[in-house]
C-alpha cells in the first residue's frame, strides 16, 4: 500500500488550482470515478460505452476533468482549506466484468498560506 | 476507510508548521512509533517502561513531538512539499503482547501556498 | 429482476406515424444506454438505434435516414420510439433491449408494427 | 459498416451431439484483450436471451455446456451436448462500431 500510493503523486499544481489525479488499471474499459471531500462526492465522472462502441462522459457535478486510458485527474479552485480534507477516489468498473467497486488513493491536502503572506494581508487596503 | 480516516485529521497546523498524528489505542503501554515519508523513516519514537514501572522515551532523530496516552504527534517544519509526499504512522506494539507490528494511518500531503502570497513574496526586496 | 415491456404497436399505413414505448423495471434505468432491435416477419435481427444514459445522444441505423427517433424519460423509466414516414419494409417486431456495458443482456417480448395499406 | 456472416445457416442435430456454430466478421474485433463479439439464442415465438459476451465470457445462468471461442474475425459457438430444448435460432453480434451488427442467424432443427 505505501509503495503503490509513495509512487503515485496525488495531487500536483494545475494554473493556480490543485489537480487531483485518480489512477486505474488500463484494462478497465467502462467506469466511475468519484472524488470524495471527506464524507461529501465533489465530483463524479462516468465513462461508458454504448453498443457501437461509442462513448458517453457524464460529469453531473461539472468539474473540470481529464481523463486519459488510465487516470481521471480533477481540477479544484484553491478552496479554503486551512484545517486540511481528506480526498479519496473511488472507482466503479463496470467493464470488464465482474462489477467492481474500490477505493483508490487517498490523501489530504493543506491549503497553507505562510505566516509572513497573513502579515503582509493586514498591510493591504 | 473513508469513514476512518476522514474522522481522524492526520494533519494540521501548528506553528507555521505541520503537526502529524499518529493515534494509537489507550491499551497499548509500550511502543514504537515510526512516521514515514515516502519510503523514508522520518521519525521514529519509542516508549518503553522499566522494572520500576520507570518510563523511557527514545527519541534518536530528534524530532520535536507530543505524546499522550492515546496518540504520538511529530512537529514538522514546511519542507518544499510541493511535489507532495505520502506519510505513514507505523506502530509497533510491545506491551501488552504479543508483539505487533501495524501501519497505522496513512495521508498524502501536499503543502499548498496560495497564489497571493507568492505574488507578495516577489514585491519583497 | 430486470423487465422490459414494449407497448404502442399495430398496423399503420405506409407514411403514417407511431409511438412506441418501452417500460422498465427492476434496475436503474437512468444507469444505462437502451436501444432498439427490430426483427422482420421470418427475418433476422436489425439493429434500429440507440440512446445514452441521460438521452443527451443518440445513434441510429442507416435504414433510419432522420425517419425515427429515439428518446427517453428516466423520471418515468420509459424508453420511446417514434416512427415517421413508415414503410411497407418497416414491418417488424421491434425489441426494447438494454445494452448491458458489453452485450444487450435483457429484452423485452416485442410489439409487432405492421406496415400495411 | 461491419459484415457478420453465420454457418451453417441451418443444422439438424441430435440430443447428445456436439454442435459448432460459425461467425466471421468483416474486420477485426479485437480491442485491447477483448474481442467484441456475443451470441444469443432466440426460440421460437420468445425474444432473443444473451448467452455469450467478450466472445467467450459466459453470461449469468447459460449453461456450461455453451462455449464460445475465437478471436479477430474468426469466432465459434460450441454446444458440448445438444438438448431439446436448445433448438431455435442463433446470432452472433458485433459491438466493434456503430452500427453493432448481427449475423445471418443459424437455425437448430431437430434431425
Known amino acids: 500500500e505505501l509503495n503503490d500510493l509513495a509512487n503515485h503523486r496525488m495531487f500536483s499544481f494545475h494554473d493556480g488550482g490543485v489537480q487531483i489525479s485518480c489512477n486505474y488499471p488500463e484494462t478497465v474499459q467502462q467506469l466511475k470515478m468519484q472524488l470524495f471531500k471527506d464524507r461529501e462526492v465533489l465530483c463524479d465522472l462516468t465513462k461508458t460505452k454504448g453498443s457501437g462502441n461509442t462513448v458517453s462522459i457524464k460529469n453531473p457535478m461539472s468539474c473540470p476533468y481529464q481523463l486519459s486510458n488510465n487516470s481521471v485527474s480533477f481540477f479544484l479552485d484553491n478552496a479554503d482549506s486551512s484545517q486540511g480534507s481528506y480526498f479519496l477516489c473511488s472507482l466503479s468498473i463496470f467493464d470488464p466484468p465482474p462489477f467492481q467497486e474500490k477505493n483508490l488513493s487517498g490523501g489530504y491536502l493543506l491549503i497553507y498560506e505562510s505566516q509572513l503572506c497573513c502579515q503582509l494581508k493586514l498591510w493591504l487596503p | 476507510e473513508l469513514n476512518d480516516l476522514a474522522n481522524h485529521r492526520m494533519f494540521s497546523f501548528h506553528d507555521g508548521g505541520v503537526q502529524i498524528s499518529c493515534n494509537y489505542p489507550e491499551t497499548v503501554q509500550q511502543l514504537k512509533m515510526q512516521l514515514f515519508k515516502d519510503r523514508e523513516v522520518l521519525c521514529d519514537l519509542t516508549k518503553t517502561k522499566g522494572s520500576g514501572n520507570t518510563v523511557s522515551i527514545k527519541n534518536p532523530m530528534s524530532c520535536p513531538y507530543q505524546l499522550s496516552n492515546n496518540s504520538v504527534s511529530f512537529f514538522l517544519d514546511n519542507a518544499d512539499s510541493s511535489q507532495g509526499s505520502y506519510f505513514l504512522c507505523s506502530l509497533s506494539i510491545f506491551d501488552p503482547p504479543p508483539f505487533q507490528e501495524k501501519n497505522l494511518s496513512g495521508g498524502y500531503l501536499l503543502i499548498y501556498e496560495s497564489q497571493l502570497c507568492c505574488q507578495l513574496k516577489l514585491w519583497l526586496p | 429482476e430486470v423487465q422490459l415491456v414494449e407497448s404502442g404497436g399495430g398496423l399503420v399505413k405506409p407514411g403514417g406515424s407511431l409511438t412506441l414505448s418501452c417500460a422498465a423495471s427492476?434496475?436503474?434505468?437512468?444507469?444505462?444506454?437502451m436501444d432498439w432491435v427490430r426483427q422482420g416477419p421470418g427475418k433476422g435481427l436489425e439493429w434500429v438505434g440507440n440512446?445514452?444514459?441521460?438521452?443527451?445522444?443518440?445513434y441510429y441505423a442507416p435504414f433510419v435516414k432522420g425517419r425515427f427517433t429515439i428518446s427517453r424519460d428516466n423520471a418515468k423509466k420509459t424508453l420511446y420510439l417514434q416512427m415517421n414516414s413508415v414503410k411497407s419494409e418497416d414491418t417488424a417486431t421491434y425489441y426494447c433491449?438494454?445494452?448491458?456495458?458489453?452485450?444487450?443482456?435483457?429484452w423485452g417480448q416485442g410489439t409487432l408494427v405492421t406496415v400495411s395499406s | 459498416d461491419i459484415v457478420m456472416t453465420q454457418s451453417p445457416s441451418s443444422l439438424a442435430v441430435s440430443p447428445g451431439d456436439k454442435v459448432t456454430i460459425n461467425c466471421k466478421s468483416s474486420?477485426?474485433?479485437?480491442?485491447?484483450?477483448?474481442?467484441?463479439l456475443a451470441w444469443y439464442q432466440q426460440k421460437t415465438g420468445q425474444a432473443p436471451k444473451l448467452l455469450i459476451f467478450?466472445?467467450?465470457t459466459r453470461h449469468t445462468g447459460v449453461p456450461d455446456r455453451f462455449m464460445g471461442s475465437g478471436s479477430g474475425t474468426d469466432f465459434s459457438l460450441t454446444i458440448n451436448s445438444f438438448q431439446t430444448e436448445d433448438l431455435g435460432d442463433y446470432y452472433c453480434?458485433?459491438?466493434?462500431?456503430?452500427?453493432?451488427?448481427f449475423g445471418p442467424g443459424t437455425k437448430l432443427e431437430i434431425k
Open positions: 433491449t438494454r445494452w448491458g456495458r458489453y452485450a444487450f443482456d435483457s
Open positions: 427492476g434496475f436503474t434505468f437512468s444507469d444505462y444506454w
Open positions: 440512446i445514452d444514459e441521460d438521452g443527451s445522444t443518440t
Open positions: 474486420q477485426s474485433l479485437l480491442s485491447g484483450n477483448y474481442n467484441y
Open positions: 467478450y466472445a467467450s
Open positions: 453480434q458485433h459491438h466493434y462500431s456503430t452500427p453493432p451488427t
